[in-house]
Amino acid sequence: GELETSDVVTVVLGQDAKLPCFYRGDSGEQVGQVAWARVDAGEGAQELALLHSKYGLHVSPAYEGRVEQPPPPRNPLDGSVLLRNAVQADEGEYECRVSTFPAGSFQARLRLRVLVPPLPSLNPGPALEEGQGLTLAASCTAEGSPAPSVTWDTEVKGTTSSRSFKHSRSAAVTSEFHLVPSRSMNGQPLTCVVSHPGLLQDQRITHILHVSFLAEASVRGLEDQNLWHIGREGAMLKCLSEGQPPPSYNWTRLDGPLPSGVRVDGDTLGFPPLTTEHSGIYVCHVSNEFSSRDSQVTVDVLDPQEDSGKQVDLVSAS
């Protein structure tokens, strides 16, 4: 007869490991007992369990409650056992010794490999601001056994660097993603992808990029200067900019206070029916936590009874 087993049994942490040991004997041969032991190199054999043809299953105290026989029906020549709820410390060499009648004793070894799936974590880097050089956008760390693979999935242009730390029974892999921040990256996904033999599918953690910036400010509303005449209703100036975080707007008049009746509504300055006292230099001040911008315009309210129209001068400053 001969023993049938596996060279390597692989299980995921927390799963049950079936340690196979089947005696393929000639007709009339009987198995008296199957003794299982852990036999890691450099250490003495540690008894695991005994399957006895008469007495049944004995589990040694160190494995009490963790070793069982596979569910029925059972072949009397099958000495396989189940090791419940495999932990990392179970990884190692195991031996089954089969005592048969009349053929004698046989033994076989197998290696139990316990896969520890990673629990990845993603840590964003420092705040990204337009104008910075190469900056850390995010780092992703995953620890497992064996070492996991950590990669990035994104449309954003950048560079990656990885490092690995080996522990006694596992390895931690950290990958960093660096980029040169630009406003076009705002809202773009940056996804850390972790692969591991203990995972049914890759684990993905997505970070949405936020790049602080503030665009140049400009004022709209004076495109047709002939509309700015005495008595006109609904005249308004709108301040144009964009930024991250979204900017706030403030209106002032350079040559004095805002005239009465002029309404400030965020980025919009609304005028009552125009009079000559509305003529002047208006400044839109745009700011966010990142920066601030100004844009100023000169409003000249025309008197239709005067023959000559006046020029409107637009100035932008930052």
Epitope: Q33, K54, G56, S99
Partner: antibody, heavy 126, light 107 residues
């Protein structure tokens, strides 16, 4: 015919020592694990100690650990129990017994005791 | 240590009676259980091993059953020579432990 004959019992004072012997015949002595079991007067059976076939493993009941030592001389087919620091509660008939040999090379379990000697009485009293 | 509890501690029966003694283990011991008979002034004698296997030379009126924690010794038809004390013993772990004994007396 399997035979186990104990000797060495007797009266001893508390704190004293005694060495019990068990002469075996009728079987291949070094192929079997051997045990000592005792029985206090009018009481039940209490396992004391076991020694593996080649003497490599020895186990003791907590009640005698550190005081009793089991040993064997396979060349003389004899089992021994050295008893030191004896107490009144050690008073009992001491039996040597052979373990049934149907478990091979597995120390975590014991097997039934298929042959017993006639016993030797140890009395600890002042 | 595993505790073995026998019941009853004693019983009175007549020749020809069917006698049942039970033994309970404090934890599962598969079939690592033996039954012994002891007569006054004599050494114990192995009757049953592996919970239900009859030791060579033991009359077939003795039988054992059970597995795990609950075990039974049955004498199908009590004979005069069966009046004795009976002990169960677990040998699943070291130390092996005995029940406190059941004394079978003549009614």
């Amino acid at each position: 015919e399997v035979q186990l004959v104990e000797s060495g019992g007797g009266l001893v004072q508390p704190g004293g020592s005694l060495r019990l012997s068990c002469a075996a015949s009728g079987f291949i002595f070094d192929g079997y694990d051997m045990s000592w079991v005792r029985q206090a007067p009018g009481k039940g059976l209490e396992w004391v100690s076991v020694i593996k076939d080649h003497g490599g493993y020895k186990f003791y009941a907590d009640s005698v650990k550190g005081r009793f030592t089991i040993s064997r001389d396979n060349s003389k087919n004899t089992l021994y129990l050295q008893m030191n620091s004896l107490r009144a509660e050690d008073t009992a008939v001491y039996y040597c017994a052979r373990e049934y040999s149907d478990v091979v090379d597995y120390v975590s379990v014991r097997t039934p005791l298929d042959y017993w000697g006639q016993g030797t009485l140890v009395t600890v009293s002042s | 240590d595993i505790q073995m509890t026998q019941s009853p501690s004693s019983l009175s029966a007549s020749v020809g009676d069917r006698v049942t003694i039970t033994c309970r283990a404090s934890q599962g011991i598969s079939s690592y259980l033996a039954w012994y008979q002891q007569k006054p002034g004599k050494a114990p004698k192995l009757l049953i091993y592996a919970a239900s296997s009859l030791q060579s030379g033991v009359p077939s009126r003795f039988s054992g059953s059970g597995s795990g924690t609950d075990f039974t010794l049955t004498i199908s038809s009590l004979q005069p020579e069966d009046f004795a004390t009976y002990y169960c013993q677990q040998h699943y772990t070291t130390p092996p432990t005995f029940g406190q004994g059941t004394k079978v007396e003549i009614k």
